[in-house]
Interface confidence: medium
C-alpha cells in the first residue's frame, strides 16, 4: 500500500463576483518549493527523526511521504549536494516487522530500495542518489510536505496584462 496523497483540482468556471477573479492558483507558502501537487520544505538545521516529525507537525505538515520512484527522483533532483541527507516519513515498525509510513501505510517492495538494516529504531533518509536506513537518534536534516492550498487572487482586469 502506498501513502495516500490528496489531489487538488481547480474549477476555473466558478461564480464570479463584481470584482473580476483570476482562475484559482495553487500556491506554496513562502520558502516552500512546489513539486507537482506538493509543497516541500527542506530544513536547514538537523534533528533526530522524532524531532523532525514534530517540527513538521508544528508547520501543519508532515514528514515527506513518497508515492513512487518518480516522486523520489523528483525530490532527489532538488538535493544539490551529495553530502546532505534528509529524513523522510518512513520508519521500521518492530511489531509489524515492516517499513511503515507515518500515515500508517506500509512500504511496497517496488517503491523504494532501502540500503541498510531493517531493525528496531531504524528510520529512513534520502540523499541525492540513494535511500538509506539509520538509527532514528541520528541528527540530520529533514523534509516536510504539505498539499498545495487553493488561493484566490482578486485582481482588476487590467492587472492581468
Amino acid at each position: 500500500q502506498k501513502p495516500s496523497i490528496g489531489k487538488c483540482s481547480v474549477d476555473i468556471q466558478q461564480n464570479r463576483t463584481k470584482t473580476t477573479e483570476r482562475p484559482d492558483l495553487l500556491n506554496c507558502p513562502i520558502y516552500w518549493q512546489q513539486v507537482q501537487e506538493k509543497c516541500l520544505l527542506f530544513s536547514h538545521t538537523v534533528n533526530p527523526w522524532n524531532n523532525s516529525l514534530a517540527d513538521c507537525s508544528t508547520k501543519e505538515s508532515s514528514l515527506l511521504l513518497i508515492q513512487d520512484k518518480d516522486e523520489l527522483t523528483r525530490t532527489q533532483n532538488l538535493i544539490h549536494d551529495k553530502a546532505i541527507s534528509f529524513w523522510i516519513g518512513l520508519n521500521f515498525s518492530l511489531s509489524e516487522k515492516n517499513w511503515k509510513w507515518i500515515n500508517g501505510s506500509f512500504l511496497s517492495s517496488n517503491d523504494l530500495k532501502i540500503t541498510g538494516d531493517a531493525k528496531e529504531n531504524s528510520c529512513v533518509y534520502i540523499s541525492q542518489t540513494s535511500v538509506y536506513s539509520e538509527y532514528c537518534s541520528t541528527e540530520m536534516k529533514w523534509i516536510c510536505q504539505k498539499e498545495l492550498t487553493l488561493v484566490r487572487n482578486k485582481v482588476s482586469p487590467d492587472s492581468w496584462l
Epitope: H44, T45, V46, P48, D81, K82, A83, I84, S85, T115, G116, Y125, S127, T129, S130, Y132, E134, Y135, S137, T138, E139, M140, K141
Partner: antibody
Amino acid sequence: QVQLVESGGGLVKPGGSLRLSCAASGFTFPQYYMSWIRQAPGKGLEWVSYISPSGATIYYADSVKGRFTISRDNAKNSLYLQMNSLRAEDTAVYYCARSLMSTGTHLYFDLWGRGTLVTVSS
Amino acid sequence: DIQLTQSPSSVSASVGDRVTITCRASQGISSWLAWYQQKPGKAPKLLIYAASSLQSGVPSRFSGSGSGTDFTLTISSLQPEDFATYYCQQVTSTPPYTFGGGTKVEIK
C-alpha cells in the same frame, strides 16, 4: 572568520590526563557534527571521536573507548576532549574538525584547526 | 572495520604531469569517500567528497572517481603547490571513519 582553534596540548606522563579544547568561530557551531582526529608523528590520520550537534550521539574509535570523553558547549561554541589513562601511543597532533554540511551520517571534514600536540612520555 | 589501502605510497612527478592515486576499500562503501591534501606542518584540506564532488575553492585540476571498492584521485596537471601527502577517507554510516595510509607526491 571561519576557524577552529585547539588548545590544551602538552607533555604528560603515561597514565595521566589532559583536556583539549577547540574554540569555533565564524559559523553556526550548534548545527554541526564535530570530530577529533589525530596524527602521530610521521604517521597517517586517525579519526578519534565525533559528537552530534546536540551532544546526544557520540562515537569513539576502539583505541580510545573508555579513556577519552568528547563533549561540547554550544553556548560557548566550544568542543572538548577529556583524555584519561594516557599511553605513549596517544602521542599525536590532535585536530578538531567540522563535518561538511550539517548532516550526521556522512562525515566529511571541511574545516580543520591547526592542531595541538599531545606528548605522552615518562 | 573497513580498511582503506592507498597506492602508491609515494610517487615522484614533475610539474605538468598527470598524477593518479588509487584507494581500495575492504568492502563496498558506495560513493562515501573523501580525499584530503596535507602539507608538512599543516592541517589536512578537503579536496573531494562523495567520491567525485569537488569541494568549494579547490582547483578543477583535481578530480575524483569510483564507487563501491575502487576509487581514484587524479591531478590532471601537477602544479608546484600540489606536492603534498594525499589521504582517502571512508564515511559510511557507522564509525570508525578510517583513513588510507597516505600517498606522498614528491618532486622528481
